[in-house]
């Protein structure tokens, strides 16, 4: 019986060009975490395996950093990074737990300021 629950940072926002930490935490279970996958919609971003450590998908290597912990840091954010992110915890003996985070990447306040107040 799966008793665990995934706690996530929920809905979060960040500025374009900035960075954000995606965090999930598995609680209320004694199951052993064997692997955590991070996905963005239908793309595999990264995997943290208990034996092998981190694997970052090559196409995201420049903008994704492992950690802290089992979390994932997204850097140099663009508006296209807006969307759903999933942490998928593979555990033994429970099975798989999935958490969801929605990230909204906003135009930076500097960019908004520049657009509204033009120097003559």
């Amino acid at each position: 019986m799966m008793t665990g629950t995934i706690e996530t940072t929920g809905n979060i926002s960040a500025e374009k060009g900035g960075s954000i930490i995606l965090q999930c935490h598995l609680s209320s279970t004694t199951a052993q975490v064997t692997q955590v996958n991070w996905e963005q919609q239908d793309q595999l971003l990264a995997i943290c395996n208990a034996d092998l450590g981190w694997h970052i998908s090559p196409s995201f290597k420049d903008r994704v950093a492992p950690g802290p912990g089992l979390g994932l840091t997204l850097q140099s954010l663009t508006v296209n990074d807006t969307g759903e992110y999933f942490c998928i915890y593979h555990t033994y003996p429970d099975g798989t737990y999935t958490g969801r985070i929605f990230l909204e990447v906003l135009e930076s306040s500097v960019a908004e300021h520049g657009a509204r107040f033009q120097i003559p």
């Epitope: 793309q43 595999l44 034996d51 092998l52 593979h90 003996p93």
Partner: antibody
């Protein structure tokens, strides 16, 4: 250099048994999940069985469930496939493969041929 | 079980041609799709994993794309050593399943 070397194949009569071995070297065997995949003569690839790094969990194709048993000895860096109640349709080349992160097979052995015939 | 349908089952091409092989899953498999190359009498070789990641040591003329149910393997400029059979494989759930293969032959 990563190497996987299968052995134990041969000719066996229907209903008979064989035990295949896969000797691993060049990497930390105990950190990787492993698969057995087979290929009947002139046919495509068919997944047979998987085992996790710690041997805590294994899974099987329906076609071999209850007849084949996958196991591993991490102290000997060896993967096994015990095949019982063999049938003519089990005739194939059997490959072992290393599976990083449980998702892709990055190294394969050269294969061992199992022929089930009377 | 997830069915993997590969097309075409065979194709004839010339050295230098751009070759595209498609693979369709019977349900969404996210990006858990791998591509292998196999030559006669040899073990399969991993080319692409996780739909689009090029395996170390594989020439950059090979590329993979797609997510969900539809995937593509592209060889940008076919070389003599590329004549072989190519298989897709889903690793989303067990039983793991392969496509039927695409044999790339010399025209």
């Amino acid at each position: 250099e990563v190497q996987l070397l299968e052995s134990g194949g041969g000719l066996v009569q229907p209903g008979g048994s064989l035990r295949l071995s896969c000797a691993a070297s060049g990497f930390t065997f105990s950190s990787y999940s492993m698969h057995w995949v087979r290929q009947a003569p002139g046919k495509g690839l068919e997944w047979v069985s998987s085992i996790k790094s710690s041997a805590s969990y294994s899974s099987y194709a329906d076609s071999v469930k209850g007849r084949f048993t996958i196991s591993r000895d991490n102290s000997k860096n060896t993967l096994y496939l015990q095949m019982n109640s063999l049938r003519a349709e089990d005739t194939a080349v059997y490959y072992c493969a290393r599976v990083p992160y449980d998702y892709w097979m990055d190294y394969w052995g050269q294969g061992t041929l199992v022929t089930v015939s009377s | 079980d997830i069915q993997m349908t590969q097309s075409p089952s065979s194709l004839s091409a010339s050295v230098g041609d751009r070759v595209t092989i498609t693979c369709r899953a019977s349900q969404s498999i996210s990006s858990y799709l791998n591509w292998y190359q196999q030559k006669p009498g040899k073990a399969p070789k991993l080319l692409i994993y996780a739909a689009s990641s090029l395996q170390s040591g594989v020439p950059s003329r090979f590329s993979g794309s797609g997510s969900g149910t539809d995937f593509t393997l592209t060889i940008s400029s076919l070389q003599p050593e590329d004549f072989a059979t190519y298989y897709c494989q889903q690793s989303y759930s067990t039983p793991l399943t392969f496509g039927g293969g695409t044999k790339v032959e010399i025209k």
